[in-house]
C-alpha cells in the first residue's frame, strides 16, 4: 500500500526554510540520495532527496542525477556513484537506515538544463528494500495535465539548507553542502500558474515556468525549499483515498535566497509523467507495486 505513513502527518504545521523537524516515520517514502562522482576531477560529492515508489524504485529530479559537468551536456552520473538511504531521520546516525546502491539511473530523455523542463528521473535499486513503518512508498498521482489545484496545501521534506542566513552563493563558492541533521518539513500552498509565471518573467534571466512545472510557497516568503532539498517529494493528501500522493519534485527557485519574498519554489509536475514513470518501472498501473491513486 502506498501513501499511508504509520504515523499520521499533522494537519497544522508551524509557520527546510521556516520548517520544523520531522518525527521518525512521518515521511517513510523520503530518500536521501548521495552522489560521489569519482569521474570528476577533483571528485565531486552532492546530495538530494527522492521518494520511494516501490521496493525497487526511487523518484527524484533529473538535475540531482546529472553529472555536474563544466558544460551543459546532460549526462547521467554513473550508477556506481549513487547511494540511496531510506528510513533515515538524522543524517548523523545512519545505523537505523537502509542503504542501497543503484542498479539503474534513468533521466527523462528531454530534461533540459537551460530551463529545467522535464526535471524528473528514476533510480532502480540494486536490491528491493524491506518495507516497514519507516520505509513505505508514496502514491503516484493520476495522469492529470492540470496538476495540483491552486491554493492546495502540500508537504515537502528534506535535509537541505535550513539556515536562512547561509546564502546560496556562499554554499556554491565554498563547495560545502550544508545539511540539516534532522529531516525538516514545511507546509506550502500551490500558487496559481499565472501568478508564478508573472513573478518569474519580471526577473532578468531565463526563468520560464513551463506547463511541466508548478509553484508553491508564500508571497511574503519565510518558508521554502532550498539547495539540497532537490528531488524531494511535494505530497498532497488525496481527499477520497486519504493517501499521500507525490504531486511535485523540488526542482528550482529564483536567483534570490531561498525563502525570499515573492520567490516561489518551482516543482516538477509529476502528474504529467505518470505514464513515463510506469513505462520505466515496467509495471502496468493495474498491478503497481506502490500504486496510483485512482
Amino acid at each position: 500500500e502506498c501513501g499511508q505513513p504509520s504515523r499520521s502527518l499533522p494537519s497544522l504545521v508551524k509557520r527546510i526554510i521556516g520548517g520544523r523537524n520531522a518525527e521518525p516515520g512521518l515521511f517513510p517514502w523520503q530518500a536521501l540520495i548521495v552522489v560521489e562522482d569519482t569521474s570528476r576531477v577533483p571528485n565531486d560529492k552532492w546530495f538530494g532527496s527522492g521518494a520511494l515508489l516501490s521496493e525497487s524504485w526511487i523518484l527524484t529530479a533529473a538535475h540531482v542525477l546529472r553529472s555536474q559537468r563544466r558544460d551543459t551536456t546532460v549526462i547521467p552520473v554513473s550508477k556506481e556513484h549513487v547511494t540511496v538511504y531510506l528510513g533515515l531521520h538524522d543524517v548523523r546516525d545512519k545505523s537505523g537506515a537502509v542503504n542501497s546502491s543503484a542498479a539503474r539511473v534513468v533521466l527523462h530523455p528531454d530534461f533540459n538544463i537551460q530551463n529545467y523542463n522535464h526535471d524528473i528521473a528514476l533510480v532502480q535499486l540494486q536490491e528491493p528494500v524491506p518495507l516497514g513503518p519507516h520505509v513505505m512508498p508514496v502514491c503516484l498521482p493520476r495522469l492529470e495535465p492540470e496538476g495540483p489545484s491552486p491554493h492546495m496545501l502540500g508537504l515537502v521534506a528534506g535535509w537541505g539548507i535550513s539556515n536562512p542566513n547561509v546564502t546560496v552563493d556562499e554554499i556554491i563558492s565554498s563547495g560545502t553542502r550544508t545539511l540539516s541533521d534532522v529531516l525538516q518539513y514545511v507546509k506550502l500552498p500551490v500558487v496559481p500558474h499565472a501568478e508564478c509565471k508573472t513573478s518569474y518573467e519580471s526577473r532578468s534571466g531565463n526563468y520560464s515556468v513551463t506547463e511541466n512545472m508548478f509553484c508553491a510557497g508564500y508571497y511574503e516568503g519565510g518558508k521554502d525549499t532550498c539547495l539540497g532539498d532537490s528531488g524531494g517529494a511535494f505530497v498532497i493528501l488525496d481527499d477520497l483515498s486519504q493517501r499521500w500522493v507525490v504531486q511535485g519534485l523540488v526542482s528550482w527557485g529564483g536567483p534570490e535566497e531561498c525563502g525570499s519574498k515573492q520567490v516561489y519554489g518551482v516543482y516538477t509536475k509529476v502528474s504529467n509523467y505518470v505514464d513515463w514513470v510506469w513505462e520505466q518501472m515496467g509495471s502496468p498501473q493495474g498491478r503497481a507495486p506502490g500504486g496510483t491513486v485512482s
Epitope: S39, R69, D71, T72, S78, Q114, D169, I172, W252
Partner: antibody, heavy 114, light 112 residues
C-alpha cells in the same frame, strides 16, 4: 594515468576519406564524452563534435555535420573520426579530448595534397 | 550560434608584469538554474595540445598556478595573469560551453 593516444600523420588526396583514432586509457571510457577539435596551421581552435561512448550519442558543430562522422569502439576504448570528401581546407591538426578537456591527445596532422 | 570575441589578439609584456585579456560572448553564458557561467580558458603553448586553465569562468583547474585568475559573468569575462613568467608564452583561448561549444579567436601572449 589518463592518456589519449592519437593515430599518426596522414597524407591524403583531395576527395578521399581518412579515419583518425583516439585510444583512451587510465579511466572508464564510457563515463565521459570524447570531443574532437580542429586547428589549421597558425589558426585557432574549432570544435567539431562529441560522442558519448555509453550510448553512442553524438553532437556536431553544424559546420562539420557533412564532413565528420564520430564513432566509438568500447571494446578497445577507442574513438574514431571519419573525415569525408577532403579538400585543402581540411589540412589541419585534429585533437581529441576527454574528461571535459582535462586530457588531450597529442594531435594528428592531416595533410591533403594531390 | 554563440560568437566569442577575444581581445587583444596579441600582446607583449615583460616577465613579472600583470596582464589581462578579455573575452566577450554574443549572449549570456550564465545558466539561471545551475547559477554557473559556462566559460573556460585554455592555454596552448607552441607545438603542444591545449591545456584547460579555468572553467565556470573562475574555477581554477587543479594544478594550475594561482597567478591565473578568471573572472566575469554573463557576457564579459577576463583572464588575468598576476605576474607573467617566461613559460606563460602561449596563445590563450576562451570557450563557451553554454550551448555546444565555441572557441574565441585567441590572444597571443609574447614575452618582451
Amino acid at each position: 594515468q589518463v592518456q589519449l593516444k592519437q593515430s599518426g600523420p596522414e597524407l591524403v588526396k583531395p576527395g578521399a576519406s581518412v579515419k583518425l583514432s583516439c585510444k583512451a586509457s587510465g579511466y572508464t571510457f564510457t563515463t565521459d564524452d570524447i570531443n574532437w577539435v580542429k586547428q589549421r596551421p597558425g589558426q585557432g581552435l574549432e570544435w567539431i563534435g562529441w560522442i558519448y561512448p555509453r550510448d553512442d550519442r553524438t553532437k556536431y558543430n553544424d559546420k562539420f555535420k557533412d564532413k565528420a562522422t564520430l564513432t566509438v569502439d568500447t571494446s578497445s576504448n577507442t574513438a574514431y573520426m571519419d573525415l569525408h570528401s577532403l579538400t585543402s581546407e581540411d589540412s589541419a591538426v585534429y585533437f581529441c579530448s576527454s574528461l571535459e578537456d582535462t586530457y588531450w591527445g597529442q594531435g594528428t596532422l592531416v595533410a591533403v595534397s594531390s | 550560434d554563440i560568437v566569442m570575441t577575444q581581445s587583444p589578439s596579441s600582446l607583449a609584456v615583460s616577465a613579472g608584469e600583470k596582464v589581462t585579456m578579455t573575452c566577450k560572448s554574443s549572449q549570456s553564458l550564465l545558466n539561471s538554474r545551475t547559477r554557473k557561467n559556462y566559460l573556460a580558458w585554455y592555454q596552448q603553448k607552441p607545438g603542444q595540445s591545449p591545456k584547460l586553465l579555468i572553467y565556470w569562468a573562475s574555477t581554477r583547474e587543479s594544478g594550475v598556478p594561482d597567478r591565473f585568475t578568471g573572472s566575469g559573468s554573463g557576457t564579459d569575462f577576463s583572464l588575468t595573469i598576476s605576474s607573467v613568467q617566461a613559460e606563460d608564452l602561449a596563445v590563450y583561448y576562451c570557450k563557451q560551453s553554454y550551448n555546444l561549444y565555441t572557441f574565441g579567436g585567441g590572444t597571443k601572449l609574447e614575452i618582451k
